[in-house]
């Protein structure tokens, strides 16, 4: 049990990993909280993102989605997730069509379909994750000042 | 010192619209809190309305609200309204315009509240 | 929608004494649970947060704690200033349900 007056500390116990993921397809990214009820900010270069035809967000208690839509060239590049003072970078890599199936002659029609109908796409490949940068942003917060600043 | 205080309240026929204006001093508006309304009829509990986000593009509305009210806000002016129509008897209430913590969803600070009477 | 149950009604102690008022979700919420205290005439006013955090301001006497679905708020060395209706709510997010802020039906703390 924490201690009464003790504000507490806003942390990732799963922090989004970088994706390749090739055009055309959806890239998501999750993130977990120690806690439920905790705000969470996505930012793209910098900037905060909203829920748009372009990202979908998406919180479940301590569960926390991004959702880049039909990814293109202008998608890649670097993101970050925001809990009060924790910070988490992480990177979409998009690859391609040509490069990521490269065809010397049209392919045969497959017999049979790969994936059921709306099935999702298969996951794109892991990057690795790249180390939290350091505490205390000074980037404009969609749900709050200078993250990990005390309000009470 | 920060502060929250409401305004528009009256009396309403039912049916009718009310815009509740809520005017924030005292903390740098534009800098990204969530504001919310929060309901009380006479001698009830509360009841949680609209919040909106710092840039205006995100909100939320209790499912109970069916697009009935609008919550909107003005950073030039530092206020946030909360539009209501087709008012029926059972939106009489005080109204309270409140702030959600920069961390978590909580009401950190809450306005003296507005009475909103719906009657015939 | 998430449900909140909040109990007793109405408690009466006296002055010195404790009480415990009880606060049950219709399903898990993550100790995202605050709990208010409004008297007649005024606005709410945050007392915990998170389960069990203090804002400043607010004297130890006062203390959340619970998990799950299950959540307790304890005054003692009550003082007749704490003669008040205090509120549980739940900040349970979920965008799939739209839940974001419920609020038990309050209870009344009579201070003899």
């Known amino acids: 049990m924490p201690e009464p007056g003790k504000k507490p500390v806003s942390a990732f116990s799963k922090k989004p990993r970088s994706v390749e993921v090739a055009a055309g397809s959806p890239a998501v990214f999750e993130a977990e909280t120690e806690r439920a009820g905790v705000k969470v900010r996505w930012q793209r270069g910098g900037s905060d993102i909203s829920a748009s035809n372009k990202y979908g967000l998406a919180t479940e208690g301590t569960r926390h989605t991004l959702t880049v839509r039909e990814v293109g060239p202008a998608d890649q590049g670097s993101y970050a997730v925001i809990a009060g003072s924790s910070k988490v970078k992480f990177d979409l890599k998009v690859i391609e069509a040509e490069k990521a199936e490269p065809m010397l002659a049209p392919a045969p029609a497959p017999a049979e379909a790969t994936g059921a109908p709306g099935e999702a796409p298969a996951p794109a490949a892991e990057l690795g994750e790249s180390a939290p940068s350091p505490k205390g942003s000074s980037s404009a917060a969609l749900n709050g000042p200078t993250p990990g600043a005390p309000d009470d | 010192q920060e502060q929250l205080e409401e305004s528009g309240g009256g009396l309403v026929k039912p049916g009718g619209t009310l815009t509740l204006t809520c005017k924030v001093s005292?903390?740098?508006?534009?800098?990204?809190?969530?504001m919310c309304w929060v309901r009380q009829a006479p001698g009830k509990g509360l009841e949680s309305i609209a919040c909106?986000?710092?840039?205006?593009?995100?909100?939320w509305y209790a499912n109970w609200v069916n697009g009935r009210f609008t919550v909107s806000r003005s950073t030039s002016l530092n206020t946030v309204d909360l539009k209501m129509t087709s008012l029926t008897v059972a939106d009489t209430a005080t109204y309270f315009c409140?702030?959600?913590?920069?961390?978590?969803?909580?009401?950190?600070?809450w306005g003296p509240g507005t009475l909103v009477t719906v009657s015939s | 929608d998430i449900v909140m149950t909040q109990t007793p009604a109405s408690v009466e102690a006296a002055v010195g004494g404790t009480v415990t008022i009880k606060c049950q979700a219709s399903?898990?919420?993550?100790?995202?649970l605050a709990w208010y205290q409004q008297k007649p005439g005024q606005p709410p006013k945050l007392l915990i947060y998170?389960?069990?955090y203090l804002p400043s301001g607010v004297p130890s006497r006062f203390k959340g704690g619970g998990s799950g679905a299950e959540y307790t708020l304890t005054i003692s060395d009550l003082e007749c200033a704490d003669a008040a209706t205090y509120y549980c709510?739940?900040?349970?997010?979920?965008?799939?349900?739209?839940?974001?802020?419920?609020f038990g039906g309050g209870t009344e703390v009579v201070v003899k």
């Open positions: 409140a702030r959600e913590s920069s961390t978590e969803y909580y009401y950190n600070l």
């Open positions: 005292g903390f740098d508006f534009s800098s990204g809190y969530d």
């Open positions: 909106i986000g710092s840039s205006s593009a995100s909100t």
């Open positions: 399903q898990s919420i993550g100790n995202a």
């Open positions: 998170s389960t069990s």
């Open positions: 709510q739940s900040y349970y997010v979920s965008t799939s349900s739209s839940d974001r802020s419920s």
